[in-house]
Every structure is written in C-alpha cells, then in structure tokens.
Interface confidence: low
C-alpha cells in the first residue's frame, strides 16, 4: 500500500466565490474516497466535480475533486480522503 499525497488549492471563480480543488496523487491501490465536506459532512455529488482515477506512470494513481464555494465560508470546508483504511482531512489554504 502506498498512501496518497493530498494537496488542496484554490482559485478565483465568480465574484465572492472560489473553486477549491483537492488532488490525491501517488497512491496504490486505486480505490480511494475523496470528497469535499462542509461542517464535516460530505457535499452532495451534484455540487462536486471528480476527475477519473488515473495511473500516473509510476505504478500508482492520481485523482481530484473540486467544488465552488463562497469565499466568506471557506473555513467551513475540508477535503476528506480515505484510502486503505486510513483517513485524513485537509483544509482550504488561506
């Protein structure tokens, strides 16, 4: 088992909103849960966009999930990752 490296980035969207993206890379096996949470609770599927779980050329995998949120509420959002029985939570960088 190779645990993922998780990286959260943010970019400007429409006025008052930002798009936050959570990327998991270099993990094996390919099964992974990656989702955005608000107040600790997973957002609905239709408010998130997922990338495919793709091989990264090193025998490991990569994927991403993104959502658009209100800039004033960004501290309420975290990216949750679960892989091979381990989990971690990642905040939006300020």
């Amino acid at each position: 088992t190779v645990p993922p490296m998780v990286n959260v980035t943010r970019s400007e969207a429409s006025e008052g909103n930002i798009t936050v993206t959570c990327r998991a890379s270099s993990f094996y096996p390919r099964n992974i849960i990656l989702t955005w949470r608000q107040d600790g609770v997973s957002l609905s599927h239709d408010t998130q966009q997922w990338g495919d779980v793709l091989p990264d050329g090193n025998g490991t995998y990569q994927t991403w999930v993104a959502t658009r949120i209100c800039r004033a509420e960004e501290q309420r959002f975290t990216c949750y990752m679960e892989h091979s029985g381990n989990h971690s939570t990642h905040p939006v960088p300020s």
């Epitope: 949470r37 107040d39 600790g40 609770v41 997973s42 957002l43 609905s44 408010t47 501290q75 309420r76 975290t78 949750y80 679960e82 989990h87 971690s88 939570t89 905040p91």
Partner: antibody, heavy 122, light 112 residues
C-alpha cells in the same frame, strides 16, 4: 474512543469572562471537529459552535457569535471556549463533544466531556 | 431555526414495557447531501448525554438493539422494545441538517 476532560466549576461575576477547557486524549486531536453545548438546569441543550482542530476553523450558532470564542491548542490537544460579558442567563453546564464523521457514521456528538458548571452571580 | 418538538413531555412506563417517543421538526430535515441527520440522545441525572441513534435509524456503537429509530421528513420516532431500569432518563432528539443545529425539549421516561 478517547477521553475528553473538562475544567472545573466556575463562579464568576456578571460582566466578567470565563475560559473553559476540554483536554482530549486517545485520538488524533487535529483530525476532529469539537462542538460546545449549553444546558441550563432542567432544560434542553443548545449547540453553541464547533471548531475544527486541524485548522482552528469555526462555525457559530448566530445566537452566540458575540458571546463565545473557540480556540484550540494542538500541542496539548486541548479545546477552549471563552465566554464573555457574562450575565445570569449564562449560568449553565457547558459541554464539549467530539463529532464522529468517519466511515459510515456521520454522528454529531458521539463522545462528550463531563461538563463544566458555570454560575454567574454577584 | 428548525424547531424540534418532542412528545410526550413525560412518559411513565413499567419495566419491560415498550416505549414510543415522538419528535417532529418544523421543516424537512433532509441535508443537501440527501442524508437525514436526526439523532437521539439519552441523558441520565447528573450525567452527560449519550448518543443512541444517528441518521434516523442507526444504532451507535454499544447501544442495545432494544432501541430503534424510524421516520422521515418531519416525523421521527424512537422505540424502546423492553424498557430496563438503565433506560430511565431524558431523551432528546436533535437535527444536524440545518445550521444552527437544534435539540428538542426532551421526553422524560420514568417509572409508572
């Protein structure tokens, strides 16, 4: 499961502030959401706010935004709530509680501290 | 805010009886992610509350199977199939779907 040990009872004067602590052990502190709740004698519970220990991010019940301030000290795995401008209406037991959002659970207040009694009296 | 109304206020029971507690919310408490975050807590005198049921019908770890939760939308029920002495206390329902999260006023289960 872990433990949550709250600080002892407080007797404070109206207008003063009080800082309550909730020392945790037995789980990864920085991975958790911790809420504070209020219960007046013989009454129901009110949710005050939560803090995400990993970042110090918070969300407040609007009713308490001017009253409560939540902080964490990750080095000691302790959560704090400062309550300010106290009145007799703030006399209550205050609880800290840990959320359990992992796996399939999604439970809000899964593990509780023993509570701290705050009495506001002249 | 979502108002949670519990009935009855007091429920006298005999040990071994079935008890049924009701909780009604002032609005639908389905979270935007599709889950219904309705929980039940038991508080015994002088103790902290303890979680019994989460997401309407899921028993928390260590909770006996005589406790069961049901309901949807705005109407929810907690049933205790055979009341034991250790079940006496005040039961609170709680919604975590809409901020601010709110509790019901409680139902006190006591010996008849």
């Amino acid at each position: 499961q872990g433990q949550m040990q709250q600080s002892g009872a407080e007797l404070v004067k109206p207008g003063a502030s009080v800082k309550l602590s909730c020392k945790t052990s037995g789980f990864t502190f920085s991975d958790n959401y911790i809420s504070w709740l209020k219960q007046k004698p013989g009454q129901s519970l009110e949710w005050i706010a939560w803090i995400y220990a990993g970042t110090g991010g918070t969300s407040y019940n609007q009713k308490f935004t001017a009253k409560a301030q939540l902080t964490v000290d990750t080095s000691s795995s302790t959560a704090y709530m400062q309550f300010s401008s106290l009145t007799t209406e703030d006399s209550a037991i205050y609880y800290c509680a840990r959320h359990d959002y992992y796996g399939t659970s999604g439970a809000w207040f899964a593990y509780w501290g023993q509570g701290t009694l705050v009495t506001v009296s002249a | 805010d979502v108002l949670m109304t519990q009935t009855p206020l007091s429920l006298p029971v005999s040990l071994g009886d079935q008890a049924s507690l009701s909780c009604r919310s002032s609005q639908n408490i389905v979270h935007i992610n599709g889950n219904t975050y309705l929980e039940w807590y038991l508080q015994k005198p002088g103790q902290s509350p303890k979680l019994l049921i989460y997401k309407v019908s899921n028993r928390f770890s260590g909770v006996p199977d005589r406790f069961s939760g049901s309901g949807s939308g705005t109407d929810f029920t907690l049933k205790i199939s055979r009341v034991e002495a250790e079940d006496l206390g005040v039961y609170y329902c709680f919604q975590g779907s809409h901020v601010p999260w709110t509790f019901g006023g409680g139902t006190k289960v006591e010996i008849k």
